[in-house]
């Protein structure tokens, strides 16, 4: 069953290679637990960058060694990429899936183009 | 070790109302759903709802709207029943159980059942 | 509501031979997310119900690998390849396809 995530179509990371963007979903039903996935995709290739399952009143835990974090608000999830690099640079798609109580719900966003550029290096002082 | 203890039998007079506790232990309280299930002496499992422990919101069987109500205190790891205007119809076996996401939402951990009966 | 129908009893089964218990749902369990929303569990006798498989095939920890079930979206069997006195019990499929959760009438396994 699908359902619709909206998500935006662009935004720049910061200066620390910080990216934060909202992830809103439309609840076909009472979700109490849902289940968020970060993808990023890349000529083509989509791989997972992080994924977080969540009971609604709780905090959205990302696994430790992951680079987001995040928080919920009703049926919004703000999310937050650290660590990027220009390299990075990419789309980066939402994934939503209401896992309890069933029926089950899974929606994609259309993605967020994150733009990350490398600050420029100090110049040596003599 | 998981466990959920629930409290001892009850009989009961009609019309009056009951509440039954089932106390967890051995695992974080507020990582798991926790449902209700009613055994009509000997005979199947009926689904009464769930609740989740971090901010008390239930999900329930309409067939059992108005009759039970479920609760929880976080600070004792309890989940709570209450079943009203009580009728012969409720007599039965009422479990607890623990939801695991892992088996997809499968209830994993059973208490050991509270058993009520309505006699006047 | 999802009915789920099971036969009262099984044919008596002797220790050591294998046993079958069927369950059919009124709608089909198979989500288009590839996962089928059937379980099993297991009641014995003077005891809470067990849970023995969820996601229709998978056993639950614990649960020796002489139990095992498949099925399609509607009809399922749990199959017990090398039955023990301790297998004993009723034996109850479920669904959690869609609320509410709802399960079979139960099967009795018995022993010649």
């Known amino acids: 069953k699908a359902m619709h995530v909206a998500q935006p179509a662009v935004v720049l990371a910061n200066s620390r290679g910080t990216a934060s963007f909202v992830c809103e979903y439309a609840s076909p039903g009472k979700a109490t637990e849902v289940r968020v996935t970060v993808l990023r995709q890349a000529d083509s290739q989509v791989t997972e960058v992080c994924a977080a399952t969540y009971m609604m009143g709780n905090e959205l835990t990302f696994l430790d060694d992951s680079i987001c974090t995040g928080t919920s608000s009703g049926n919004q999830v703000n999310l937050t990429i650290q660590g990027l690099r220009a390299m990075d640079t990419g789309l980066y798609i939402c994934k939503v899936e209401l896992m309890y109580p069933p029926p089950y719900y899974m929606g994609i966003g259309n993605g967020t183009q994150i733009y990350v550029i490398d600050p420029e290096p100090c110049p040596d002082s003599d | 070790e998981v466990q959920l203890r629930q409290s001892g039998p009850e009989l009961v007079k009609p019309g009056t109302s009951v509440k039954i506790s089932c106390k967890a232990s051995?695992?974080?309280?507020?990582?798991?759903?926790i449902n209700w299930v009613k055994q009509n002496h000997g005979k199947s499992l009926e689904w009464i709802g769930d609740?989740?422990?971090?901010?008390?919101?239930?999900n329930s069987n309409q067939k059992f709207e108005g009759k039970a109500t479920l609760t929880v205190d976080k600070s004792s790891s309890t989940a709570y029943m209450e079943l009203r205007s009580l009728t012969s119809e409720d007599s039965a076996v009422y479990y607890c159980?623990?939801?695991?996401?892992?088996?997809?939402?499968?209830?994993?951990?059973w208490g050991q059942g509270t058993s009520v009966t309505v006699s006047s | 509501d999802i009915v789920m129908t099971q036969a009262a009893f099984s044919n008596p089964v002797t220790l050591g031979t294998s046993a079958s218990i069927s369950c059919r749902s009124s709608?089909?369990?198979?989500?288009?997310?590839?996962?089928?929303?059937l379980y099993w569990y297991l009641q014995k006798p003077g005891q809470s119900p067990q849970l023995l498989i969820y996601?229709?095939?998978n056993l639950a920890s614990g649960v020796p690998d002489r139990f095992s079930s498949s099925g399609s979206g509607t009809d399922f069997t749990l199959r017990i390849s090398r039955v023990e006195a301790e297998d004993v019990g009723v034996y109850y499929c479920?669904?959690?396809?869609?609320?509410?959760?709802?399960f079979g009438a139960g099967t009795k396994l018995e022993l010649k």
């Open positions: 159980a623990r939801l695991r996401r892992e088996y997809f939402y499968a209830m994993d951990y």
């Open positions: 609740i989740n422990p971090n901010n008390g919101g239930t």
């Open positions: 051995g695992y974080k309280f507020t990582d798991h759903f």
């Open positions: 479920a669904q959690n396809l869609e609320l509410p959760l709802t």
């Open positions: 996601q229709m095939s």
């Open positions: 709608k089909s369990l198979l989500h288009s997310n590839g996962i089928t929303y």
